[in-house]
């Protein structure tokens, strides 16, 4: 079924970063143009386990007042599932030096429930969004970000994780999904594909796109990520589907034009501050929203979805610099670095629009076969 | 590999001028921010100032500021210290360094004699 | 300001602790640096406890609190230099800040 076509409304318009013209219908693949590609190829369907990258690699975390971000973000977090009581210990070798979880990997074993038990949780991310079950949420207000305007000094770090490229962002990144729900922005990082293959962890009506970036971020009434890993809303995670345009994002440049020094796994450089808020979309009042989880171990739950109902345009040149200038574990590319969408299990996305429109021309009002749950309570 | 060399050290008299460059290499110059260090004989390391990767952002240590401006030229590669109205105090080995929340790769330094 | 011992002695083999105190400075991110003299510093820790390629896992750093640490294993006599600690400190008109710096004698 095709996404309806509504002038500025119609789900994931495309545009960012200033360009505003949504698409039309015709430029959304339908579910039949593309496969659904729940999984990267050769990967089982093992609920709750597939494939992504490092998108919660929240080590040791702990407030930072300089250039590297409130949070410590290299790896992964330095907790297991919660409820998993853990010794405090410097996690900064992680990846190397190997503990449980930084033995994860996109595909294959070992399973992700082994890695952590959260991975088979019921509320697991990322899904498919269906526009037309979408709850319209009227309390849903525009997305508010303030201090992500970033002066060029002090750099920044671009990593190599080995599961994504992870750009840590400095303290004062302030984002509020509405009245009293106030974050802090800890990094951002990307998920892509392959030659020819899209790579979103999200989909739309089964719709995969090129790539996907997620901005995660800590929610103020805690101090760390360990803290917050498991409680609702502790974290919240921006993502925004990045899809090809004519033109090269200068944004995303300032970020792709500098993979090639961190091509080898567990790589990392410093680049200038940037404005963040350039990587998204410019629309702050369209999006979705649901409870999930991170996409990647330690999976804990609790995370606050907010996904962009504009995508952002990359230049063909640009995307395939970003699936396939990034090495990986054991001398293979960084691809395919997402997981494969997990089961609503009863959930409902909101909508901060009305999304769920039925197109065929006997429908004069919207249809929305959710209503909205009292959304910011 | 990434190299830094600087030149234009010497002795010079207090109240003059001293233009002190860092020539890089091995790397793309353009793309990083620099940074000054310097430390006097028998002492510690002390931060100078520091440019961003394009030039259009400077901050110096308060001792400096007012005498000292920083510059680069991205074209040639190379970093440059312009040091004025030089004091005894300013006596020290100068280091460029590539990086400003850490300095990753320095040079070898260029000794600044300050004596009258 | 960051406060360093001027000195620690170390016997070969054994331990090396070197600490870099400040006012909550495990909110911010510290980098060590190896100083031999007539040499120009190295990068040995950096992000409190990430390790440069080429430099020993002997070295390692923490970071909480009011005190940061490197801490040197399996101490070696090539060992024997200055050590010193960095921030950036966005606060201040010092945005990058070292510490004094710290002998290290090996025995």
């Known amino acids: 079924q095709r996404l309806p076509r509504m002038q500025e409304d119609s789900p994931l318009g495309g545009g960012s970063s200033g360009e505003d013209d949504p698409l039309g219908e015709e430029d959304l693949p339908s579910e039949e143009d593309s496969p659904r590609e729940e999984d990267p190829p050769g990967e089982e369907d093992l609920p709750g386990e597939e494939d992504l990258p490092g998108e919660e690699d929240l080590p040791e975390v702990k407030p930072k007042s300089e250039e590297e971000g409130s949070l410590k973000l290299e790896d992964l977090p330095t907790v297991e599932a919660p409820g998993d009581p853990q010794e405090p210990q410097n996690n900064a070798h992680r990846d190397k030096e190997g503990d449980d979880q930084s033995h994860w990997r996109y595909g294959g074993d070992p399973p992700w429930p082994r890695v952590s038990p959260a991975c088979a949780g019921r509320f697991q991310s990322p899904v498919d969004i269906r526009p037309q079950l979408a709850a319209f949420c009227p309390a849903l207000r525009p997305l508010e970000l303030l201090g992500f305007q970033l002066p060029p000094l002090p750099e920044l770090r671009l990593r190599n994780n080995g599961h994504s490229v992870q750009l840590t962002l400095p303290p004062g990144l302030e984002m509020a999904l509405g009245p009293g729900r106030e974050y802090r922005a800890l990094q951002l990082h990307l998920h892509w594909g392959a030659a020819g293959r899209p790579g979103s962890e999200h989909t739309v009506e089964g719709h995969r796109f090129p790539a996907e970036i997620h901005v995660v971020h800590l929610s103020t009434a805690f101090a760390r990520v360990d803290e917050a890993l498991g409680r609702p809303g502790g974290l919240a995670v921006l993502a925004a589907f990045l899809e090809e345009g004519p033109e090269e994002n200068s944004a995303y440049e300032q970020l792709l034009s500098r993979l090639e020094e961190i091509a080898e796994e567990g790589s990392e450089t410093q680049v200038p501050g940037l404005d963040i808020s350039a990587l998204l979309p410019s629309d702050f009042s369209r999006y979705f929203q649901y409870e999930g989880s991170l996409t990647t171990p330690p999976c804990a739950q609790g995370v606050i979805w907010t996904v962009f109902n504009q995508t952002v345009m990359l230049s063909a040149k640009q995307l395939h610099t970003l699936s396939d200038t990034l090495w990986g574990p054991g001398d293979s590319r960084l691809q395919l670095n997402f997981r494969a969408t997990q089961p609503l299990n009863g959930r409902v996305i909101e909508a901060s629009f009305p999304a769920g429109v039925d197109s065929s021309p006997r429908a004069a009002e919207p249809v929305q076969l959710n209503s909205c749950l009292a959304a910011g309570d | 590999q990434v190299t830094l060399k600087e030149s234009g050290g010497g002795v010079v008299q207090p109240g003059t001028s001293l233009r002190l460059s860092c020539a890089a290499s091995g790397f793309t110059f353009s793309n990083y921010a620099m940074t000054w260090v310097r430390q006097a004989p028998g002492k510690g390391l002390e931060w100078v100032g520091l440019i961003s990767y394009d030039g259009s952002v400077t901050h110096y240590t308060d001792s400096v500021k007012g005498r000292f401006t920083i510059s680069r030229d991205n074209a040639k590669n190379s970093l440059y210290l312009q040091m004025n109205t030089l004091r005894a105090d300013d006596t020290a080995v100068y280091y460029c360094?590539?990086?400003?929340?850490?300095?990753?790769?320095w040079g070898q330094g260029t000794l600044v004699t300050v004596s009258s | 300001v960051l406060t360093q011992p001027p000195s620690v002695s170390v016997a070969p083999g054994q331990t090396a602790r070197i600490t870099c105190g400040g006012n909550n400075i495990g909110s911010k991110s510290v980098h060590w640096y190896q100083q031999k003299p007539g040499q120009a510093p190295v990068l040995v820790i950096y992000y409190d406890s990430d390790r440069p390629s080429g430099i020993p896992e002997r070295f390692s750093g923490s970071n909480s609190g009011n005190t940061a640490t490197l801490t040197i294993s399996r101490v070696e006599a090539g060992d024997e230099a200055d050590y010193y600690c960095?921030?950036?400190?966005?606060?201040?008109?010092?945005?990058?800040?070292f510490g004094g710096g710290t002998k290290l004698t090996v025995l």
């Open positions: 960095q921030v950036w400190d966005s606060s201040s008109d010092h945005h990058v800040v």
């Open positions: 360094a590539r990086g400003s929340g850490y300095q990753e790769h």
